[in-house]
């Protein structure tokens, strides 16, 4: 696994990323695991980065990702009691200059090196399904979420609100 030292070199509260020329309002480091407590890890293979979902050994250190939170500049279309808040989108970066990307054509989640401003494929709408779980919905493809398939991350279509609690799109964030 890689990325721990790389991320810690840029744990500044704010750094220059943008959706529409704006900076993230908040950033922090966290490890990412599945609903079933498998860890999301990142490895360099053949000059490209691979993402794995795996059980770690007892004392093995978890990879961290830098979560950057952005306020949507568009007003929410949803009715209800939350419309006065701005929708939050996140980017996830396990090491400097690399971000998780949604590849909608291949239904895959990939790590891409890219320059700022980041493309829309790097942004995910954040959902809270359970008290300690989050889900990541593709900004570029509403209804499609980051999920777990065959020990890899993949894009999974969620057809109805009942399926938002499907375990394979639920993730835990941990700072330890």
């Amino acid at each position: 696994a890689f990325g721990i030292s790389g991320v810690q070199k840029y744990t500044r509260a704010l750094h220059d990323s943008s959706i529409t020329g704006i900076s993230p309002i908040t950033e922090y480091l966290a490890s990412l695991s599945t609903y079933n407590d498998q860890s999301i890890t990142f490895a360099l293979e053949d000059e490209s980065y691979e993402i794995y979902v795996e059980d770690l050994k007892k004392d093995e250190k978890k990879d961290k990702v830098l979560l950057s939170y952005y306020e949507s500049q568009h007003p929410s279309n949803e009715s209800g009691d939350g419309v006065d808040g701005k929708m939050l989108m996140v980017t996830l970066s396990p090491t400097k200059d690399f971000w998780l990307h949604a590849n909608n054509k291949e239904h895959s989640v990939e790590l891409h090196k890219c320059e700022k401003p980041l493309p829309d494929q790097a942004f995910f709408v954040l959902h809270n399904m359970h008290s300690n779980c989050v889900s990541f919905e593709c900004k570029t493809d509403p209804g499609v979420f980051i999920g777990v398939k065959d020990n890899h991350l993949a894009l999974i279509k969620v057809d109805s609100s009942e399926n938002l609690c499907t375990e394979n799109i639920l993730f835990k964030l941990s700072e330890t």
Epitope: I25, T26, L29, E78, G82, M87, L88, N128, V134, T176
Partner: nanobody, 121 residues
Framework: QVQLVESGGGLVQPGGSLRLSCAAS????????MGWHRQAPGKGRELVAV???????NYADSVKGRFTISRDDTKNTVYLQMNSLRAEDTAVYYC???????????????WGQGTLVTVSS
């Protein structure tokens, strides 16, 4: 709707201390993080400190070692203990929370009205 109410601002001498509080209320399902931003006269808003639901924290370089952020999950309240205050800490301090409500799973960003902190002799 989620409301954030800040308190604890005021006038303090350089080297002094203040404790800010921010209470979140409304139909809150979950809170992902709560934090403090500040805006000095004529400047943009900047992050001061954030604490996540898991207890992780992040601080602006300018306040590390002087400010401490904490939260009480049972009350959906966040605190900012500010020590060794300097004139350059003078600003309006805003509470910010990322939360979802019972009407939607989408996490949204909510802001308080702000509380003024003035550091002056």
């Amino acid at each position: 709707q989620v409301q954030l109410v800040e308190s604890g601002g005021g006038l303090v001498q350089p080297g002094g201390s203040l404790r800010l509080s921010c209470a979140a209320s409304g139909s809150i399902r979950t809170v992902n993080y709560m934090g403090w931003h500040r805006q000095a006269p004529g400047k943009g808003r900047e992050l001061v400190a954030v604490v996540t639901s898991g207890g992780g924290t992040n601080y602006a370089d300018s306040v590390k070692g002087r400010f401490t952020i904490s939260r009480d999950d049972t009350k959906n309240t966040v605190y900012l203990q500010m020590n060794s205050l300097r004139a350059e800490d003078t600003a309006v301090y805003y509470c910010n929370a990322a939360a979802s409500t019972y009407s939607s799973t989408v996490v949204r960003s909510f802001w308080g009205q702000g509380t003024l902190v003035t550091v002056s002799s």
